[in-house]
Each structure stands twice: as C-alpha cells, then as structure tokens.
C-alpha cells in the first residue's frame, strides 16, 4: 500500500501519530467481562492523541496499522491463587464493534502468573471498538503501573 | 498536540528518532537494587542513538511520548526458586531523577516464573533518568538476548 | 546515523516502513526446532509489507532498526505440563541466517506458563533471516490470537 | 539422573589431532536451557576452561585454545565433541565434559574425567 | 580474561576448626561467581553459587560471602569428607575462569 501523492506533501501529523495509552478505571458488572478503560493527562501519564473512549472502551478513528500492547496485573494474587481456579483467568482483546469486525486480536491466560504483558502488530479502521475482556473472578489491579492499555499508529 | 510550521519543514531526523538497546552490565551493591546497564556496537547488538547513559542508568535528551521496553531474565533460576521467597522478586521501571518527576512507570514480579517482558508508551521529558529495580537476592542473566531495555522516541 | 539529503527529500515510503505480522502455520519435522510462518490478508489479519517469506522463515529486505516481537502459547497446556519436564520448553529468536551474522536475539522459556510474549529493538541488515526455535516437545497453538511474529522497521 | 561420559583415545602423538566425545544420558542435549561444555585439567594444576557447545551448533571458545579446537553437536546421538588440532605435551590433562546453565555458567552436571596423554 | 587469585594455595587445619578461603578477581564480577570442591579422581562438585547461594544437598557449615572481586568461602566446623581442593569460578564473562585451587589437608 503505498502513500498517495497528497500524503507524501501534507505535513507528517497528517499521516497518523494516533496514539493512547490509557489506565484502568473499573470492571465491568457482573455478566460484563469487559475491562473499563480512561486516560487523560489529569488523570497521570495516561493520554489520548486520535483515538477516543466510548464508555470506557478505546475507538480508532483513523485506519493502519497499530501496535496494540497491554498489561494487566491481578489485585491479590500468588501462584496458588491463579492456579486454583478451574478455568484460568484469561485476557483478551478483541475488535467488539462493529460486529460484522469483530474478531480476537490477542489473548493470553494467566496459569500460575499474576500478570499478562504482550503486544501485536494489526490493521486497524476508522469506527473499530478495541474490547478487554478479563473472564474470571480475580480482580485487576488498578495501580497505573501494573495495568495499562494502548495503541500506536505505525503506518497506513 | 500539533507539530509546528518549523517542524513540518525540518528533515525527518529532526523530529526525534531517538532510540537505545542496553544490555545488562552489573548490578548494584548491596542495599542498590538498580541494574547497571551498557550499551554501544563494541559490546555487540546495543546501542544508543539520542538517549545517554550517567553511571549505567538511561538519560532521556528528547521530550515526547516513547515506547519503553524491558526483559529481564533471572540467572539461577526454577519455578520453585522463585516461589520460595516470601517477597517475590520484582522488578521496576522508573524515573529516578529529577527527584520532582520521580515515579513507577512499569511493574512486574515474577511469582513462579524466570523472565518478566513488558512495554508502555509514557510520556517522558529531557533529563528524565530511568531507572529499573530488581528488588530480592536473585541475580538476573547476563546474557544479551535474555536480559535488555530499550527506549524509542514514537512521537512529540 | 544522520539522514543523507536525498533521504530526506525522498517520499516517507522510502525511508522504511517496512513491517510484517505472521501466524504459524506449522511446526518443523523432527530435530528441525524451527516455527513456520505464513502471512497474507487472505489467511486473516496477518500480513508482509516489505519482508519476505522464505520457506516460513522471515527475510528482511531493508537495513535498520526493527523492533521485532512475538508471542507464543503451548497448544495442551497446564503449569504441570510445562514444570513436569526436565528441560523447560524455549523459545528463541534469532538470525539463522547468512550463516556469519548467525544470533540469539530474544530468548524466553516457559517454565509454569503457557505462554511467552517479548519484544525488542535490534538492527538487521537486507538478507537476514530470522528463525523462531521453539525446543521440547509441547506444541504451539495455530490460534492467530495466541501465537503470532512481527517485526516493524523504526529507523534506518 | 542426568549422566555425562567422555569416550576417546587415551594417548595422542603430539602434532595430531585430540578428538574427545562426551555423550548424555537421561536428559536430552536438545534443551534450549543448557550449554555443554570442555573442561581440562593438568596434572596437579588447576581447571580451564575449553568452550562450550550449544544445541544448534553456536559455540564459544577459550581464546588461547580457539585457533586450535573444533566442537560439534550430534542431536540424534546426544553427544557432543571436542577436536584439538597440533597438539604437544602441555595438552595432556584430564579432559571433562560438562553442563551449564544457559543463563548462567554453573558448572552443575560434570563426566567423570578422561586422562589424555601426548607423547609420541 | 578475568584472572581468578586463590588464596593461600594450600592450609592444613583440624577437624572443627573455622577455614575461611579468600578467591580475588582482575576485575569486578559482581555477584557472578561460584565455589567447588574436588577430591582425588573426581570431578569437581558445586558447592556455592552466586557468591552466596548454598547449592541444593550442600551442608550449611558451607558459606560464601563478597562481591565485585573479593570473595570468601567458610566453612563453620571442619568435617572428615572437607579434605579436598576447593576452587573459585567466575560466571560473568567469557572465558570462564576458575582460580588455582586452594587444598585443605589434615593438620
């Protein structure tokens, strides 16, 4: 895909920069596995630049490719309390809305760790709603160091 | 925030680029938990290019939002040596000075593993020191593909 | 490493952008610890723009500094299938390729987890090819959410 | 419990070629946590270290030894071997292979030792 | 290459007694550094790992303590099966080197 002619002479912003890193607010209720997300530099180091929230989850608005990364770290929590459940706590996200797009783009269980970190490269578009669904009944930790999500613009 | 008229006109490098590998040196003497780290194309893939290092910690010399990543790998080391202490060993990312900036960018612990892998995106300002903490008496590998942290300069 | 004028003149595309998100496709026969990739917007979310495939391994085709990640989860997994073995389960990245640049770039082992994520900066040259080792005898899950391998070009 | 044994000539005339093979038992070498390494020992004198081997092939050697040794890794047999070329007099030790962790050089599983002597 | 400096070379002691043997390095090691011990016909055997770490089935009257390029190993109350050769390693850079051995015999 290559840049058109009106890209490569608008100035660099015009191509993307679209960027967040956000900080967890709450969970959802229950029957809710979703993770509730907020950002903003009031807030600490958590900033949106492009994308925005819709009731605590992350929108694209403009459309490439993304880094996506995220941590979470369980609250209370040993080896023996992840393990001891039957199903482990697992993290996904995933593309939630629009329906017709939506897909997992990440996932990771816990086992016997108390905190997931991983990241991916994926084509993102205008209107995508980024989900994080924690299944279980460990709760995240809410510390902004621990648990946090983001997104980066890389290329068209 | 936007990028200025003088910005858009600069050649690309002006905007940042910068970008640093470190791999681990040392670690600190007793009552020291920080990791001393190196970096340059004589000791092998590391490098520095914009970021400095003071007495083995990371000076940033460019404001804007970076993506900050770290593995740490611990050198002697089982599932049960890392369960059998009562504090897990746990390692932090963070400004250290200016003491008015100082604070916790990334946390993990290890619990019953041997590596921690993480990233975010945080904003950080010229003359920020990261410093990253391995709390507990496990000493961490030395090996450059298992131990590194680096830094990249996303965006202004 | 400054950017030459004719760089800096030159449209955005050709200072890079080169990047690529790969899923497995299988894994080698035996005593050949290799994982084969694949990537393509007909198999799904991944793709190549700008490095190859040769034989599922990945080739890069331009010079710079890439910031190369996976993740990698075990297909039948539990914390007591990982600890029961002798040897933890590994997963290493490195150039296998031309044989004198030959290097571990990034290794994990699993021990109680199921799944490894990383990432890291390190320079590659036009040529290299990179080979994901993964030894034991766990099998990694094709899942395109829990097993995937990219790279993004960042600076020349 | 993992075992090592070295296996190879006892006597070797100087100016040849030293070639030792260590082979593992009850653990693979085909592990991404091990180096497999030389060790020797003059008579009466102390440890140095020769090199070591990784599974796939990737070594390190003792740069006083490097112009002169050779390793190779045989998956399919779990053994690895150790060739020094020209040898003289002051090459005769007792040769032990052992393992090491791959994060960290910890000497932890060793051969019983094999005596090599170099006399024509 | 790191040299490793043993020291004394060789000591003769009683059983019960406290034996304290001093390893030196070239150049700082942190805390990548281990200690064996090699009787007649035998391989070495590890004793200490990470300067102070006691090796999983070693007696506690085994100690070792220091970092960067002094290093001490002790042991508390010399025992019949302690007569042997004891030897320092470094873990912190290629080539590994280990130091010339120090021989604790029977006074």
């Known amino acids: 895909q290559r840049l058109s002619r009106a890209q490569q002479q608008l100035p660099l912003e015009s191509l993307g920069w679209d960027i967040a890193e956000l900080q967890l607010n709450h969970t959802g209720p229950q029957q809710d596995p979703r993770l509730y997300w907020q950002g903003g530099p009031a807030l600490g180091r958590s900033f949106l630049r492009g994308p925005e929230l819709d009731k605590g989850q992350l929108r694209i608005r403009r459309d490439g490719i993304y880094m996506v990364h995220i941590q979470v770290t369980l609250a209370i929590c040993s080896s023996t309390s992840t393990s001891r459940h039957h199903h482990p706590t697992t993290l996904a996200v995933g593309i939630c809305s629009p329906a017709s797009r939506s897909i997992s783009l990440l996932r990771l269980s816990f086992h016997q760790g108390c905190t997931i970190a991983s990241q991916r490269l994926t084509p993102l578009a205008r209107g995508d709603t980024l989900c994080t669904n924690l299944t279980g009944t460990l709760l995240p930790s809410r510390n902004t160091d621990e648990t946090f999500f983001g997104v980066q613009w890389v290329r068209p | 925030q936007r990028l200025s008229r003088a910005q858009q006109q600069l050649p690309l490098e002006s905007l940042g680029w910068d970008i640093a590998e470190l791999q681990l040196n040392h670690t600190g003497p007793q009552q020291d938990p920080r990791l001393y780290w190196q970096g340059g194309p004589a000791l092998g893939r590391s490098f520095l290019r914009g970021p400095e290092l003071d007495k083995g910690q990371l000076r940033i010399r460019r404001d804007g939002i970076y993506m900050v990543h770290i593995q740490v790998t611990l050198a002697i080391c089982s599932s049960t040596s890392t369960s059998r202490h009562h504090h897990p060993t746990t390692l932090a990312v963070g400004i250290c000075s200016p003491a008015s900036r100082s604070i916790s960018l990334l946390r993990l612990s290890f619990h019953q593993g041997c590596t921690i892998a993480s990233q975010r995106l945080t904003p950080l300002a010229r003359g920020d020191t990261l410093c990253t903490n391995l709390t507990g008496t496990l000493l961490p590998s030395r090996n450059t593909d298992e131990t590194f942290f680096g830094v990249q300069w996303v965006r202004p | 490493q400054r950017l030459s004028r004719a760089q800096q003149q030159l449209p955005l595309e050709s200072l890079g952008w080169d990047i690529a998100e790969l899923q497995l496709n299988h894994t080698g026969p035996q005593q050949d610890p290799r994982l084969y990739w694949q990537g393509g917007p007909a198999l799904g979310r991944s793709f190549l723009r700008g490095p190859e495939l040769d034989k599922g391994q990945l080739r890069i085709r331009r010079d710079g500094i890439y910031m190369v990640h996976i993740q990698v989860t075990l297909a039948i997994c539990s914390s007591t299938s990982t600890s029961r073995h002798h040897h933890p389960t590994t997963l290493a990245v490195g150039i296998c390729s031309p044989a004198s640049r030959s290097i571990s770039l990034l290794r994990l082992s699993f021990h109680q987890g199921c799944t490894i994520a990383s990432q890291r900066l390190t320079p590659l040259a036009r040529g290299d090819t990179l080979c994901t080792n993964l030894t034991g005898t766990l099998l990694p899950s094709r899942n395109t959410d829990e097993t995937f391998f990219g790279v993004q070009w960042v600076r020349p | 419990q993992m075992q090592l044994q070295e296996s190879g000539p006892g006597l070797v005339k100087p100016s040849q070629t030293l070639s030792l093979t260590c082979t593992v038992s009850?653990?693979?070498?085909?592990?991404?946590?091990?180096?497999w390494s030389w060790i020797r020992q003059h008579p009466g004198k102390g440890l140095e270290w020769i090199g070591y081997i990784y599974y796939s092939g990737s070594t390190s050697y003792n740069p006083s030894l490097k112009s002169r040794l050779t390793m190779s890794v045989d998956t399919s047999k779990n053994q690895f071997s150790l060739k020094l070329s020209s040898v003289t007099a002051a090459d005769t030790a007792v040769y032990y292979c052992?393992?090491?962790?791959?994060?960290?050089?910890?000497?932890?599983?060793w051969g019983q030792g094999t005596l090599v002597t170099v006399s024509s | 290459d790191i040299q490793m400096t043993q020291s004394p070379s060789s000591l003769s002691a009683s059983l019960g007694d406290r034996v304290t043997i001093t390893c030196r390095a070239s150049?700082?090691?942190?805390?990548?550094f281990n200690w064996y011990q090699q009787k007649p016909g035998k391989a070495p055997k590890v004793l200490i790992f990470a300067a102070s770490s006691l090796q999983s089935g070693v007696p506690s009257r085994f100690g070792g303590s220091g970092s960067g390029t002094d290093f001490t190993l002790t042991i508390s109350s010399l025992q019949p099966e302690d007569f042997a050769t004891y030897y320092c390693?470094?873990?912190?850079?290629?080539?590994?080197?280990f130091g010339q051995g120090t021989k604790v015999e029977v006074k």
């Open positions: 390693q470094q873990s912190y850079s290629t080539p590994w080197t």
């Open positions: 009850d653990g693979s070498i085909i592990s991404g946590v091990y180096y």
């Open positions: 052992a393992r090491s962790g791959y994060s960290y050089a910890l000497f932890d599983y």
């Open positions: 150049q700082s090691v942190d805390r990548y």
